[in-house]
Interface confidence: medium
Amino acid sequence: DSEEDEEHTIITDTELPPLKLMHSFCAFKADDGPCKAIMKRFFFNIFTRQCEEFIYGGCEGNQNRFESLEECKKMCTRDNANRIIKTTLQQEKPDFCFLEEDPGICRGYITRYFYNNQTKQCERFKYGGCLGNMNNFETLEECKNICED
């Protein structure tokens, strides 16, 4: 399963490459929501390019919200340290690309796309509309961008 190297310009202290997000929700602003609980959560800050702590109110908000720093990093950061050291980067697929197609337990039958590790391609499947896993994309394009070579 060989992957092509992706070219990157050399990064200096004053120059950062264009930010490539794994998920569009990583670009959402931290949203504490309208409720008044005090819950420690983490979000990806597109300006600092790091996962940071914020206080979540306990309801609503958005998907840029993680229970742990590790989960935030896994979902929203690529290995920027490697980018600084190397001019080329062997880009790895996120772990969830290797999860099996998962329709969940509901009966909604929504068309979604998943990465099929057998065929090494993104394919259409019917999602039930709830639960399931992260190998689940609204568009073929998004699936290809994230999971295909």
Epitope: R65, F66, E100, D102, P103, G108, C130, G132
Partner: antibody
């Protein structure tokens, strides 16, 4: 007639473990996702965990993630919930239910009481 | 605090019409997820009353009906009867990051 019968509840100390079972009959067990839903004394309903018909996919509420494990044996028409590191707040009646139409639970068992107390 | 909000209690006289509300947010009912309603008689397991917003399983009287609009849903009971005295729960799915099946806190319906 669809029947779901839970067993395995009882009194356990904080930090202890219990394994609940749910024996199913009257429907094609392997064709249905199954869930555990609990109800603390005098409180409302709380979804705990779910498992797909094949057993290949499992799902958990945040409150039990890492402590509870759902599984099923389709050859025995039985659903299980292994509960570890139990806490006082896990005290509840635990119901098993089958996922039918939409996101609904069509049929429920009679429940089994789990009490976590020292 | 439940993800879906219901009035804790309601009451009505026999023969009356009562409506139980269920208010959610943009990540559950407002995201077009179906709502279900369950009836729990004292000392018994919950029973499915309405699924997919407004569908009744066989055996449920047509006195019970459901609807959903935006971030709210409601259960209407017409021709209230003594045996309708129970707790009623709405339930849906919430797509927030750790998505899960969610319930309302329940409404205790008393038939006067």
């Amino acid at each position: 007639e669809v029947q779901l019968v839970e067993s395995g509840g009882g009194l356990v100390q904080p930090g202890g473990s219990l394994r609940l079972s749910c024996a199913a009959s009257g429907f094609t067990f392997s064709s249905y996702a199954m869930s555990w839903v609990r109800q603390a004394p005098g409180k409302g309903l709380e979804w705990v965990s779910a498992i797909s018909g094949s057993g290949g996919s499992t799902y958990y509420a945040d409150s039990v993630k890492g402590r509870f494990t759902i599984s099923r044996d389709n050859s025995k028409n039985t659903l299980y919930l292994q509960m570890n590191s139990l806490r006082a707040e896990d005290t509840a009646v635990y119901y098993c239910a089958n996922n039918g139409a939409a996101a609904a639970w069509d049929y429920w068992g009679q429940g089994t009481l789990v009490t976590v107390s020292s | 605090q439940s993800v879906l909000t219901q009035p804790p209690s309601l009451s009505g006289a026999p023969g009356q019409r009562v409506t139980i509300s269920c208010t959610g947010s943009s990540s559950n009912l407002g995201a077009d997820y179906d709502v279900q309603w369950y009836q729990q008689l004292p000392g018994t397991a919950p029973k499915l009353l309405i699924f997919g917003n407004n569908n009744r399983p066989s055996g449920v009287p047509d006195r019970f009906s459901g609807s959903r609009s935006g971030t709210s849903a409601s259960l209407a009971i017409t021709g209230l009867q003594a045996e309708d005295e129970a707790n009623y729960y709405c339930q849906s799915y919430d797509r927030s990051l750790s998505g899960s099946m969610v319930f309302g806190g329940g409404t205790k319906l008393t038939v006067l």
